[in-house]
Each structure stands twice: as structure tokens, then as C-alpha cells.
């Protein structure tokens, strides 16, 4: 199956930069988001610190670490009340991601 230009293969994601023009001059903002073409039963998430299609049940149950969101060799822990997760690097630095 051939993909049209701009079309994503099923089960894959890409990072997209959105430029937003503000009504006020010079207050332009650029936000980066992921564009995913997820298969049925999947939803956009994070795997190995990259956007990825993950099992929708993970999102539903907020078992974020089941996405394997951290880099290899890092430890994953759920935040209190499952509002996100922390990745603990070797040596003890932590990176926290909250889910809005």
C-alpha cells in the first residue's frame, strides 16, 4: 500500500510544529505536538520518550508506566493519584511528566 504525501503509516507518530499567530504583535507561540495514525484499540501516548501509539487501556486505567515512557535503563514510577509519571535516570535525576 502506497502512502500519499503527509499520510502516516498505521501505528506510527510524528512530531508536528504548530505556529499560532496571536492577535497581539510579537506574541507568537509555537507548540509542538504529536500526530499519530493509531490502529483500533490504540491511542497516542509515549514510549521510550517519543510519541507512540499505545494500548488505549493503559490510558483508561492511567497505568502510564505500561507505555514504557522512559528511556531504556531508566525507572518509571506513577505520580500520586496517577496524574503522570516520573522517569528516574541512572544516578538519580528525575524527569516528571504530568498528564492534563
Amino acid at each position: 500500500q502506497f502512502l500519499k504525501e503527509g499520510q502516516l503509516a498505521a501505528g506510527t507518530c510524528e512530531i508536528v510544529t504548530l505556529d499560532r499567530d496571536s492577535s497581539q504583535p510579537r506574541i507568537e507561540e509555537r507548540s509542538q505536538t504529536a500526530r499519530c495514525a493509531c490502529r483500533k484499540g490504540q491511542i497516542a501516548g509515549t514510549t521510550r520518550a517519543r510519541p507512540a501509539c499505545v494500548d488505549a487501556r493503559i490510558i483508561k486505567t492511567k497505568q502510564w508506566c505500561d507505555m514504557l515512557p522512559c528511556l531504556e535503563g531508566e525507572g518509571c514510577d506513577l505520580l500520586i493519584n496517577r496524574s503522570g509519571w516520573t522517569c528516574t535516570q541512572p544516578g538519580g535525576r528525575i524527569k516528571t511528566t504530568t498528564v492534563s
Partner: antibody, heavy 114, light 113 residues
Framework: QEQLVESGGRLVTPGTTLTLTCTVS????????VSWVRQAPGKGLEWIGY??????PHYASWAKGRFTISKTSSTTVDLKMTSLTTEDTATYFC?????????WGPGTLVTVSS | ELDLTQTPSSVSAAVGGTVTINCQAS????????LAWYQQKPGQPPKLLIY???TLASGVSSRFKGSGSGTQFTLTISDVQCDDAATYYC?????????????FGGGTELEIL
């Protein structure tokens, strides 16, 4: 709103021990790391050390031994500095260290002079 | 010893121009991309512009662009404005288990002509 405020900076004489405190609000120290950074007058930024919950603090090579970072409560992180010299005169900042350091406190000035 | 070399140490630009600042690390940053850029104005704490080498921090103008990986990184400021006059710093993250966790570049002062 996430905020950090440093306190404890003052004029001291060489050889003094001084403890600075970073008080945070709007986020939990159990979920985020904090770094201490200093800036001598007219100079660049210099990283001192980092602490994350449940982990030993980490220090810049030059800061090991004389500087101690500790989490003293659920909202405060201390920086203890011993045997201060005139070279330690600087504004001391604490910052939440996550994906980049953000936000930063306004800083507290430490002046070491005889 | 960990070292981040920033070049140039100072640069001048006209309003509407483009400025490029380079940052070279003595060893690869963590995950090859854990590098941030900050803007600092006199009497103020630094402000995060870019993290993870190229991700724009919240509320930062899209005129600021970060690129690079491993040991070589670049901050590009396009359509320079008077308000951009400041000192810019790069900051690399390294594995805390093997070296200093963080290091800053020496800074680049941007003057607007």
C-alpha cells in the same frame, strides 16, 4: 502557580558557614528535582548541585565537600556553604530542574567580605 | 572535566536580522539531546527558552529555534527585536552517575544595533 523563593543571603566574613533556603510552592518536591546555581557579579551561571526526592544530592566537582544540599521539609531545600571566601560572593538561585530549569527563584545575594 | 564552550562570547545584530549561537560539549549530553537554552536580562533570573535541544518552552516566540545533538548545538534567533538584547546560556545535562549532572556554557551577550 509554580514558584521558588530563595532566602538567607547576607553579608558575611571569610570563613563563615551560611545556609540558604529555597521555598517552593505550586509543585511537590516529591515529584521534581531542584538545582542550585550561582552567578558572581558580572559573570556567567555556575551549577552547584541537584537534589531529587529519595536520592543523594549531586554536586559540581568544584563544590564537593564545601557545599551540602538537603531537603529539609516538603517545601524547602537548603544549601549549606562552609568556609566561605570572597570568591563565593554571588547571587544564588534555586530552580526546578525537570525538562530544563524552570521556573527559577529571583535569587538571594551572598557577599563575603572582611 | 565537563565543559560547554559557547561561541561567540558576544554578538551584535540589527533589528530584523538573524543571530546564531553555538554550544559545544566536551562529551555527549544525556540521551544526545538534553540541552537547554536560557535568556537572561540584567537583574533577572534566567528564562528557559528551549529544552531537549529543540523543544520551545511554553510562551516563547517561534523566532527562537534550537537544533543539534550529541555534542554540537545551535540557537538561532530570527527577526531579531530590541527586546532580545540579553545574555544567552546553554546548559547541558549529563548522567549524574558518571559526571557532573549539569554544566552551563560561558554565555553569549547579544547587542542590538
Amino acid at each position: 502557580q509554580e514558584q521558588l523563593v530563595e532566602s538567607g543571603g547576607r553579608l558575611v566574613t571569610p570563613g563563615t558557614t551560611l545556609t540558604l533556603t529555597c521555598t517552593v510552592s505550586g509543585f511537590s518536591l516529591s515529584s521534581y528535582g531542584v538545582s542550585w546555581v550561582r552567578q558572581a557579579p558580572g559573570k556567567g551561571l555556575e551549577w552547584i548541585g541537584y537534589i531529587a526526592n529519595n536520592y543523594n544530592p549531586h554536586y559540581a566537582s568544584w563544590a564537593k565537600g564545601r557545599f551540602t544540599i538537603s531537603k529539609t521539609s516538603s517545601t524547602t531545600v537548603d544549601l549549606k556553604m562552609t568556609s566561605l571566601t570572597t570568591e563565593d560572593t554571588a547571587t544564588y538561585f534555586c530552580a526546578r530542574d525537570n525538562y530544563g530549569m524552570d521556573p527559577w527563584g529571583p535569587g538571594t545575594l551572598v557577599t563575603v567580605s572582611s | 572535566e565537563l565543559d560547554l564552550t559557547q561561541t561567540p562570547s558576544s554578538v551584535s545584530a540589527a533589528v530584523g536580522g538573524t543571530v546564531t549561537i553555538n554550544c559545544q560539549a566536551s562529551q555527549s549530553v544525556y540521551n544526545n539531546k538534553n540541552l537547554a537554552w536560557y535568556q537572561q536580562k540584567p537583574g533577572q533570573p534566567p528564562k528557559l527558552l528551549i529544552y531537549a535541544a529543540s523543544t520551545l518552552a511554553s510562551g516563547v516566540s517561534s523566532r527562537f529555534k534550537g537544533s543539534g545533538s550529541g555534542t554540537q548545538f545551535t540557537l538561532t534567533i530570527s527577526d531579531v527585536q530590541c527586546d532580545d538584547a540579553a545574555t544567552y546560556y546553554c546548559q547541558g545535562e549529563f548522567s549524574c552517575s558518571s559526571a557532573d549532572c549539569n554544566a552551563f556554557g560561558g554565555g553569549t551577550e547579544l547587542e542590538i544595533l
